[in-house]
């Protein structure tokens, strides 16, 4: 099926030109989406052109700034918040980027009833983090490690925690390992719903082996970086919870949250928290063997002032044929009866769908079905529930948004965007305003991505809120390469790829062949969406044909193909890769002298296993940041999928699945390897074994490093990156320059 | 010149409500702020409360919370002051006084132009 | 809240001599991002509002005799009107504006002797 027609004709050809790497470094044909900021169920801010922050009233049509650009300007505000009364908006100016999500800033608060900046009591800088209660304008933020509380902005600070130390112990923000494979937050703190409490994670790293790398900088020395970073099999965090009532501090202080017995007994992981009342408090839990997950609903005891989370509240997730979960598993959604919820978890056919449980998880009610999967939940009201999935028309990479009736039995779906643009939109996400009153859909693709706004009654649309137009008109003289989604059929096993096209694609010719490759556990590369990225400028320009391609443990087409992987990385997303490349060779259209492919952290290290497999298929290839070992990476993601590094675990295949096992089969093929020296993701640790491994086996290879660069090789580095790899791809394939 | 022009004198009886006009004319109305002073016979001034006209919000002396209201009608220029629950302890002159918007991070004004005042009794 | 306290609570000082009205705020209000101090000195003559005289410790405000003038910082101000007029017989306030609730001094009375 094409979904992304090329508007070529011949009486247009000469005036229409093709894609070029300027234009992609550059960021030329970027798109705009549309998320509103709901601060109540009518009315959302958004920051203008000009930088004002407005707010709108959808029922009124009105709309007004609350915050003017000068005031933003004036402390070189990058972003804000405003207090649920309304009264105060935080400032935040001097980002500065820490790891994945996390970040410190300098914080200002502006009171909007005075107009002027709040003075007295300022907040100390640089912040890790800092965020108003859901009611009024209580602060709770993080300062050097230790959590802190205001009543007010203007009151002096009330001190939560007094054991935060860096690199050491972690209060109300996650330690490297629980930002970017548990928590994927900055933040673990949480506010009840109406601020009455503050739960707050304690992680203590003190006993976890540090990843020490050296960030070069301008000094005469370069500086270490230390970071406390478990790799598999090592000694983990440990992690506590704990409640505080904010409107009584110091009464009785902290209480810690029980954790369930079956969950304590081993070493263990916190996984999310989910308030459902002032008084009551679901935490997740995960076995560090992670296929065993407890959920545990807290009650609040007056009396004693503590938390009590008996045994009949406690729900087991178990999975007997891989991990729990998706990539992580998934949080409840809970009904007004404040008791009852729905999740998504895999069902006795192994799909994951939703499933409503009211009292046990033996007894839950499966509100989907069917041989696809319900990916999200977006809002549960008192009679709708919407969420996503990818049920429409069996495209796996597709996402649409539906609606289930739940105060009606039967309970009837309807699918809110399966018709609205069919052919341009059919990759979405929403944003719901309080009670689903109005939500926003944000359509990624196939076609020119647009944001609109709904009435969440009737579902009509209200108003186009980002239409992209600059970017379409910017396109109609460029020769866009022609994209399709199809699916191989191999030994039981779908395969979907997508298949991007040089312009004037003619099948009885023949294109080098290039495989952009991720592949790593419960992701989706072949999704129905806009892109105009290096690929595009491939195929558009230099006449490639690009394929990516979804194989074994990729995720959304069941467990069947998600849990293949289990305690076997490295395996089969690689058998995958090559029995699609087979396959394209058979169309008849890819010159087999021309096979090319490349992938970038996990996608680095399938890209590497392919060119090491001894197929004689691929001419040359690309890793970027790849992993080369499981032993080099984080215990969380690793062992998830898995297992321990210990004998009578599977240390056995964690030994034969590393890059530099297969370094002899290097030897017939270019090989292209890149990393950052200060990744503190995917270590260059990593690349630093697979050179050495080549040039012990005297294997010749090219190899580029970014200093200073982390796991997204970004600023003036991508620039250099891409004319890089694309000088090597064009070497490979004979192309002229 | 810049004027703030506030209703007539008003008696009250204790538990009843008061409402007060600041009428302003000859500057741009959403500029400043607008705050409620009053004056107790002997006493020193004591602030209510204030609001900002281009968002309407209002901010109150914890000591009137709850009984007090400030409001603007932005289309008239004109800001109101409500107190309910009168007793006659709050007999007093009430002023309202504009207060220039800090837009600036080092900004922050004082109350540069009042109004005439408005004689508040309570009285059974 | 900041209490402002004035003295002397009344004055009485002969026509063009100094008058030297003092203000003590009970936390400061000096502004260390820009040095600023926060205060304003008002002039208050019987049945009128009171009229700014002085912002930010020392800046007169326009309109106003130069033989007003303030000094101070942090939690000690001074109000000097340095040769006494008639016209100036009236209660001086003195008032913080760094953090809310706003708030006043009591006020000091100027009489002619």
């Known amino acids: 099926i094409v979904l992304r027609p090329s508007r070529v004709h011949n009486s247009e050809e000469n005036t229409m030109r093709a894609l070029t790497l300027k234009d992609i470094l550059n960021g030329t044909f970027s798109y705009k989406t549309f998320f509103p900021n709901w601060i109540s169920g009518q009315e959302y801010l958004h920051q203008s052109a000009d930088n004002n922050i407005v707010l709108y009233n959808i029922e009124t049509g009105q709309s007004y700034t609350i915050l003017s650009n000068r005031t933003m300007k004036s402390v070189n505000a990058s972003n804000y918040g405003l207090s649920p009364d309304r009264q105060f908006v935080y400032l935040e100016s001097d980002y500065s980027k820490l790891w994945r999500y996390s970040y410190t800033a300098t914080y200002y608060i502006y009171d909007l009833s005075n107009g002027e900046f709040v003075r007295g009591n300022e907040l100390p800088r640089p912040i890790q983090y800092l965020c108003w209660s859901p009611v009024g304008s209580k602060l709770a933020y993080v300062y050097q490690n230790n959590i802190y509380l205001k009543q007010r902005p203007g009151d002096p600070p009330f001190q939560i925690t007094f054991n935060g130390r860096e690199n050491k112990i972690f209060n109300g923000i996650p330690d490297w390992v629980y930002e970017e494979e548990m928590l994927a937050t900055k933040y673990a703190l949480w506010w009840s719903p109406n601020g009455k409490f503050l739960a707050y994670a304690e992680f203590n790293d003190t006993d976890i082996p540090v990843i020490a790398y050296s960030y070069y900088g301008d000094e005469q020395y370069p500086r270490t970086i230390n970071i406390p970073y478990p790799k598999a099999g090592a000694k983990n965090p440990v992690v506590r919870i704990f409640i505080i009532d904010t409107t009584y501090p110091a009464y009785v202080g902290p209480q810690e949250v029980p954790v369930p017995a079956m969950i304590a007994s081993s070493d263990y992981y916190f996984s999310w928290l989910t308030w459902v009342t002032d008084e009551r408090v679901c935490l997740q839990w995960l076995k560090r063997v992670q296929n065993v997950s407890v959920l545990s609903i807290c009650d609040f005891r007056e009396d004693w002032q503590t938390w009590d989370c008996p045994k009949t509240q406690e729900h087991i997730e178990e999975s007997r044929t891989g991990w729990a979960g998706g990539f992580f598993v998934s949080t409840p959604v809970f009904s007004y009866d404040a008791i009852s919820y729905y999740k998504i978890f895999s069902d006795k056919d192994g799909y994951k769908h939703i499933h409503y449980i009211k009292d046990t998880v033996e007894n839950a009610i499966q509100i989907t079905s069917g041989k696809w999967e319900a990916i999200n939940i977006f809002r549960v009201t008192q009679d709708s529930l919407f969420y996503s999935s990818n049920e429409f028309e069996e495209y796996p990479g597709r996402r649409n948004i539906y609606r289930i009736s739940i105060g009606s039995y039967p309970p009837s779906k309807k699918c809110v965007t399966c018709h609205l643009r069919k052919e341009r939109c059919q990759y979405y996400t929403a944003s719901f305003s309080d009670y689903a009153k109005y939500y926003a859909l944000v359509c990624y693709g196939p076609g020119i991505p647009i944001s609109t706004l709904h009435d969440g009654r009737t579902d009509q649309e209200i108003k186009i809120l980002e239409e992209n137009k600059e970017l379409e008109n910017a396109l109609k003289n460029i020769q866009l390469p022609k994209e399709e989604i199809k699916k191989l059929e191999v030994d039981e096993i779908t395969l979907w790829y997508k298949m991007i096209l040089p312009p004037q694609f003619d099948r009885s010719k023949k294109y080098p062949l290039l495989i952009q490759v991720y592949g790593g556990p419960c992701s989706q590369s072949v999704r129905s969406v806009f892109a105009v990225n290096w690929i595009s400028y491939l195929a558009s320009k230099e006449g490639m044909v690009i394929a990516l391609v979804d194989g074994r443990g990729t995720a959304f087409q069941g467990d069947k193909l998600l849990y293949a992987v289990y305690r076997k990385l490295g395996v089969y997303e690689v058998e995958d890769q090559i029995t699609a490349v087979r396959k394209f060779i058979e169309m008849g259209f890819i010159d087999e002298k021309r096979i090319a492919i490349w992938g970038w952290s996990y996608g680095g290290y399938v890209s590497s296993l392919a060119l090491a497999s001894g197929t004689g298929l691929f001419k040359c290839g690309i890793a970027v940041a790849p992993v080369s070992s499981w032993e080099y990476y984080a215990s969380v993601y690793t062992e998830r999928f898995m297992g321990l590094p210990t004998k009578d675990d599977n240390l056995e295949h964690y030994k034969n699945s590393t890059v530099m096992a297969r370094a002899e089969y290097f030897r017939n093929v270019d090989y292209l390897l890149i990393h950052g020296t200060a990744d503190d993701n995917v270590h260059f640790q990593n690349s630093a074994q697979i050179a050495k491994a080549l040039v012990n086996a005297q294997v010749d290879f090219q190899a580029m490093w970014y200093s200073d660069q982390n796991h997204g090789l970004s600023g003036l580095s991508t620039n250099h990156l891409y004319t890089h790899m694309t000088h090597f791809l064009k070497q490979c394939f004979s192309l002229s320059d | 010149q810049v004027q703030l022009v506030q209703s007539g004198a008003e008696v009250k009886k204790p538990g009843a409500s008061v409402k007060v006009s600041c009428k302003t004319s000859r500057y741009t109305f959403t500029e400043y702020t607008i705050h409620w002073v009053r004056q107790a016979p002997g006493q020193r001034l004591e602030w209510i409360g204030g609001i900002n006209p281009n968002n309407g919000i209002p901010n109150y002396n914890d000591k009137f919370k709850g009984r007090v209201t400030i409001t603007v009608d932005t289309s008239a220029s004109t800001a109101y002051m409500e107190l309910s629950s009168l007793r006659s302890e709050d007999t007093a002159v009430y002023y309202c006084?504009?207060?220039?918007?800090?837009?600036?991070?080092?900004?922050?004004?004082?109350?540069?132009?009042w109004g005439q005042g408005t004689l508040v009794t309570v009285s059974s | 809240d900041i209490v402002m306290t004035q003295s002397p609570d009344s004055l009485a000082v002969s026509l063009g001599e100094r008058a030297t009205i003092n203000c003590k705020s009970s936390?400061?209000?000096?502004?260390?991002?820009?040095?600023?101090?926060?205060l304003a000195w008002y002039q208050q003559k019987p049945g009128q509002p009171p009229k700014l005289l002085i912002f930010?410790?020392?800046t007169r405000e326009s309109g106003v005799p130069d033989r007003f003038s303030g000094s101070g910082f942090g939690t000690d101000f001074t109000l000097t009107i340095s040769s006494l007029q008639a016209e100036d017989v009236a209660v001086y306030y003195c008032q913080q504006y760094f953090s809310y609730p706003l708030t006043f001094g009591q006020g000091t009375k100027v009489e002619i002797k």
């Open positions: 006084a504009r207060r220039r918007i800090a837009y600036g991070y080092d900004e922050g004004h004082a109350m540069d132009y």
């Open positions: 936390q400061s209000l000096l502004y260390s991002r820009n040095q600023k101090n926060y």
């Open positions: 930010w410790a020392s």
